[in-house]
Amino acid sequence: ECVTRLFKDIHFEGGDIATVFTPSAKHCQVVCTHHPRCLLFTFTGESASEDPTQWFTCVLKDSVTETLPRVNRTGAISGYSFKQCSHQISACNKDIYVDLNMKGINYNSSLAESAQECQERCTDDVHCHFFTYATRQFPSLEHRNICLLKHTQTGTPTGIMKLDKVVTGFSLKSCALSNLACIRDVFPNTAFADSNIDSVMAPDAFVCRRICTHHPGCLFFTFFSQEWPKESQRNLCLLKTSESGLPSTRIKKSKALSGFSLQSCRHSIPVFCHSSFYHDTDFLGEELDIVAVKGHEACQKLCTNAVRCQFFTYAPAQASCNEGKGKCYLKLSSNGSPTKILRGTGGISGYTLRLCKMDNECTTKIKPRIVGGTASVRGEWPWQVTLHTTSPTQRHLCGGSIIGNQWILTAAHCFYGVESPKILRVYIGILNQSEIKEDTSFFGVQEIIIHDQYKMAESGYDIALLKLETTVNYTDSQRPICLPSKGDRNVIYTDCWVTGWGYRKLRDKIQNTLQKAKIPLVTNDECQKRYRGHKITHKMICAGYREGGKDACKGDSGGPLSCKHNEVWHLVGITSWGEGCAQRERPGVYTNVLEYVDWILEKTQA
């Protein structure tokens, strides 16, 4: 059962598994949610104890029954983990705490103009977990405007104390706001040197990378595969760090793989959710339950629905036994990973999918799979929306993309002559325009936010946000697309598609079925040669075939240029302008979304 509310002046008795320090009960709840075993917690505020060393303690708790006895205690705040809930969970904490000092290892001290600058510095420093900033009013002159970057083994403070005229807060890496490079490659036959901070068992290098990503101290890893010669080290995932943040050296080793934490690009790749099945594999751990079920998918579902289950092994049924039902072993461990991995046992193993909701919805895999385009199928582009105007009569105006449960990203030029958001309707999960009838449900627009530097499409800043009046419930046919990560500046996208209901030739009409066309990106230098009369800036991105034939056209404006990278779709461009449609040597020009990520986040998270 999902319980989101906090219980004031209540202490949960017993079940303690760990104690950390957090600046608020809300943050304690997030820490509990991300801990592999925590189901309940009690947070001790200032008034709960005479002893200041006990203030801000967050006691993480577990219980077989998923509940604990409640005791009245003034100043205590208790609650439940969000593991039991179906909603999205984020580790992102943008709060700034006034007159508090979070303690840790102060490894960097520098002057900063503001707490925001200090937080940005922390976010862009590979080691930083949190910071303390001494304001202009701080009594000690030599410490004023000092920004202290801090880290700890656990990522949480070693203590929190009241301190006047300072502010404290966390790194925003988990909010996808880091400018740090994000290295996604996994390097085969490579071991990294440097310090091991921890080790866990993992079935493959990608699970090892995910574990590294949400381990607070892990910056890179080495994984010894099943074929590793030393049996005791097979499936061992070594979590590593170094002073520079990068491996000091690499060693070539057959059957070892190495890679990096994805902490600075966490929002656009699944890092919590290990959805694969591992055949002929047993995961060892503490047994929670054994249930007879039909198939390994049913076993995974059972594990996902059992809040304490972290991973499972399914033993398939013998041919004639038990109506085809096999044994489903639900398991857990202290760190969420198997204590040992055995191969060649005939079992099928995997992990709970409960943690998938800690990943951004945009990373969820969609069904596998415009001028010169072809018709799309339902659910193929679940972020694509059709924006209608009702004045003077109802018609398709522009495309757009879902980027959040209340936010649509589109082009600014779509709103020329639109006096009020009241005349706009956003239709989501639509394949054919003919589906839209008078009684078709739509989302009203609460606010149109146009970039304040926008003048006309050709001069750039052709970007706008629509805030919806109500929130979107995500389903297979309506879900967001990931924004590109700022750490991905060097990525060259090779699988890009433009979609829309726009014209199929210059003099045409809006199409009924959503069209799609695969289009290669064109360098800005090449694009500039094709548009000598315009300035192609770095805030624009171009795409098209030299020979023409496929392109976005009238009515596609505001829609997405979607590119698939590492199995995740990213919103790389917004259809903006071009000379004609699909003309030879006239690529389409799109708003380069990467350059507006800060603007988008500022507006949507204000």
Epitope: A181, D185, F187, N189, T249, I251, K252
Partner: antibody, heavy 125, light 107 residues
Framework: QVQLQESGPGLVKPSQTLSLTCTVS??????????WSWIRQHPGKGLEWIGS???????YYNPSLKSRVTISVDTSKNQFSLKLSSVTAADTAVYYC?????????????????WGQGTTVTVSS | DIQMTQSPSSVSASVGDRVTITCRAS??????LAWYQQKPGKAPKLLIY???SLQSGVPSRFSGSGSGTDFTLTISSLQPEDFATYYC?????????FGGGTKVEIK
């Protein structure tokens, strides 16, 4: 097929920074299967590895030069570059760029299989 | 750093001769070794990788062997175009290091 071409000044004054660029043609620098390396050869001597870079920006340097070396990559231009600061006459050499194969498609194929023709850099006032 | 010691530093041989060059690593490098050929005024050319694998386009008279610390490059029947300097290179651990070179000269 892939070709590499070094470019940059042939003469550098002592204490200044040596800057060389290697342009990759006939293939993309954007591949996880390669590191892109700089190697130098002093007149009449053997080969000395300076450092390598992966398209992702991951770099490794020779510890004997690390404090003076920066290697960077520009995937959009299909180029990678070498900067060597505070040069002396001892940095006079032929500088080569090379592609270092790092396990192409798992067949354990390794080694520096494509080289530039080399550019002579003289450090002199 | 791993030191790579090549011997001999030069060898005089005739066309048709069998030539063997050895390379010793100061510590074990498994099979992470490559051999290169360099002619005057030219860039090195990869001959052998992974100690014994022949790079495509390289004549089969070139062969490599060894593992751990001791490695050998053999030219089974020396041809006129084989007179050059040969280098071994370890890539087991960064920094990558080369041997001092072996010059194969005409007798």
């Amino acid at each position: 097929q892939v070709q590499l071409q070094e470019s940059g000044p042939g003469l550098v004054k002592p204490s200044q920074t040596l800057s060389l660029t290697c342009t990759v043609s006939g293939g993309s620098i954007y591949s996880g299967a390669y590191y892109w390396s700089w190697i130098r050869q002093h007149p009449g001597k053997g080969l000395e590895w300076i450092g390598s870079i992966h398209y992702s920006g991951l770099t490794y340097y020779n510890p004997s030069l690390k404090s003076r070396v920066t290697i960077s990559v520009d995937t959009s231009k299909n180029q990678f570059s070498l900067k060597l600061s505070s040069v002396t006459a001892a940095d006079t050499a032929v500088y080569y760029c090379a592609r270092d194969v790092d396990d192409s498609s798992g067949d354990e194929h390794y080694g520096m299989d494509v080289w530039g023709q080399g550019t002579t850099v003289t450090v002199s006032s | 750093d791993i030191q790579m010691t090549q011997s001999p530093s030069s060898v005089s041989a005739s066309v048709g001769d069998r030539v063997t060059i050895t390379c010793r690593a100061s510590q074990g490098i498994d099979s992470w070794l490559a051999w290169y050929q360099q002619k005057p005024g030219k860039a090195p050319k990869l001959l052998i990788y992974a100690a014994s694998s022949l790079q495509s386009g390289v004549p089969s008279r070139f062969s490599g062997s060894g593992s751990g610390t001791d490695f050998t490059l053999t030219i089974s029947s020396l041809q006129p175009e084989d007179f050059a300097t040969y280098y071994c290179q370890q890539y087991h651990i960064v920094p990558i290091t080369f041997g001092g070179g072996t010059k194969v000269e005409i007798k």
